[in-house]
């Protein structure tokens, strides 16, 4: 089948990094600067992703593969393939529409992203507070006074990413 296709379509012989140039009798021409083709048999090369603004280049574009971007320092990626960047905050803060704000009393955030979450309520598990919570850290629950068995620290899942799109002021 492959041989038959080659006889019928000369473009199928054009390798990645080239395109089948209809203006030049369907010969394989190299992709122009700032473009690429990652598969063979392409009739055009795609323009490379440009990493600028809040994005920076993680991998340069080549004739056979697209550029890859990540975020500049002070920002983190959101979405598939780092489709957007969001401003970092300090631990103990969360990102709001007005910028980074400290976690309210009774909540914490131990990451540079995500939202402030309530401290664990130790009493719900019949335990007592062993170490008080802070803006940056959850409380540590210990055994209740009546409980002689050793207490276990509470484990909290990582904070989910907040809805993207707050600009740095």
């Amino acid at each position: 089948f492959e041989r038959t296709r080659s006889l019928q379509d000369p473009c199928s012989n054009c390798p990645a990094g080239t395109f089948c140039d209809n203006n030049r009798n369907q010969i394989c021409s190299p992709c122009p600067p700032n473009s690429f083709s990652s598969a063979g048999g392409q009739r055009t090369c795609d323009i490379c992703r440009q990493c600028k603004g809040v994005f920076r280049t993680r991998k340069e574009c080549s004739s056979t593969s697209n550029a890859e971007c990540d975020c500049t320092p002070g920002f983190h990626c959101l979405g598939a393939g780092c489709s957007m960047c969001e401003q970092d905050c300090k631990q103990g803060q969360e990102l709001t529409k007005k910028g980074c704000k400290d976690c309210c009393f009774g909540t914490f955030n131990d990451q540079k992203r995500g939202i402030c979450r309530p401290w664990t309520n130790c009493s719900l598990d019949g335990k007592s507070v062993l170490v008080n919570g802070t803006k940056e850290r959850d409380v540590v629950c210990g055994p209740s006074p009546a409980d002689l068995s050793p207490g276990a620290s509470s484990v909290t899942p990582p904070a989910p990413a907040r809805e993207p799109g707050h600009s740095p002021q």
Partner: antibody
């Protein structure tokens, strides 16, 4: 409140020069890339140029490369567009705009300044 | 150059109508697509960024969808202040705008 105010538009002869300014206020200017976008009378929007936070990185649309220079003065919270060898097709309202620093969208725009190139 | 083709170039609608504007990119631009509204004599205003995220302060009747090459801006119930020209813009590579869609009163 974020504000961008352009100035410097004028009537200029073909081949002449002009310098546009954009005064920024209400935000930390040094935290943002800035752009120039233009709109010819009765036509659509055309991106012209942008510049990074410290002024070391600049990009231009092909039609103005070698003729226009984008620059910024971070101490004075100002953006500039130096336009040389002006042509009739450069006639447009020129807007300065702020890159939102999240995905390449322009979240604040000035009111625009009109550049007319005619003899 | 990545070309953005908007359709229709103009449309007439009535208050309360559902309006849909499309923008087609000449190649895959993932979700690097933004929408702006412009009224005569005024600067453009950002409505939607990253294909579907609503800009702060923009009414929820505006929504965006799509990824890759095909994108849509929808106004669920047209209001008198929505009569304007709408532009799509790609920020995947060297920025570029679509030709615009003028929405006027039927």
């Amino acid at each position: 409140e974020v504000q961008l105010v352009e100035s410097g538009g004028a009537l200029v002869q073909p081949g002449g020069s002009l310098r546009l300014s954009c005064a920024a206020s209400g935000f930390t200017f040094t935290n943002f890339w800035m752009d120039w976008v233009r709109q010819a009378p009765g036509k659509g929007l055309e991106w012209v140029a942008d510049i990074n936070k410290d002024g070391g990185e600049k990009y231009y649309v092909d039609s103005v490369k070698g003729r226009f220079t984008i620059s910024r003065d971070n101490a004075g919270n100002s953006l500039y567009l130096q336009m040389n060898s002006l042509r009739a097709e450069d006639t447009a309202v020129y807007y300065c705009a702020r890159d939102a620093m999240r995905g390449g969208d322009l979240d604040y725009w000035g009111q625009g300044t009109l550049v007319t190139v005619s003899s | 150059e990545i070309v953005l083709t908007q359709s229709p170039s103009s449309l007439s609608a009535s208050v309360g109508d559902r309006v849909t504007i499309t923008c087609q990119a000449s190649q895959d631009i993932r979700n690097y697509l933004n929408w702006y509204q412009q009224k005569p004599g005024k600067a453009p205003k950002l409505l939607i960024y990253a294909a579907s995220s609503l800009q702060s302060g923009v009414p929820s009747r505006f929504s965006g969808s799509g990824s890759g090459t095909d994108f849509t801006l929808t106004i669920s119930s047209l209001q008198p202040e929505d009569f304007a020209t709408y532009y799509c813009q790609q920020s995947y590579s060297t920025p570029g705008f679509g030709g615009g869609t003028k929405v006027d009163i039927k």
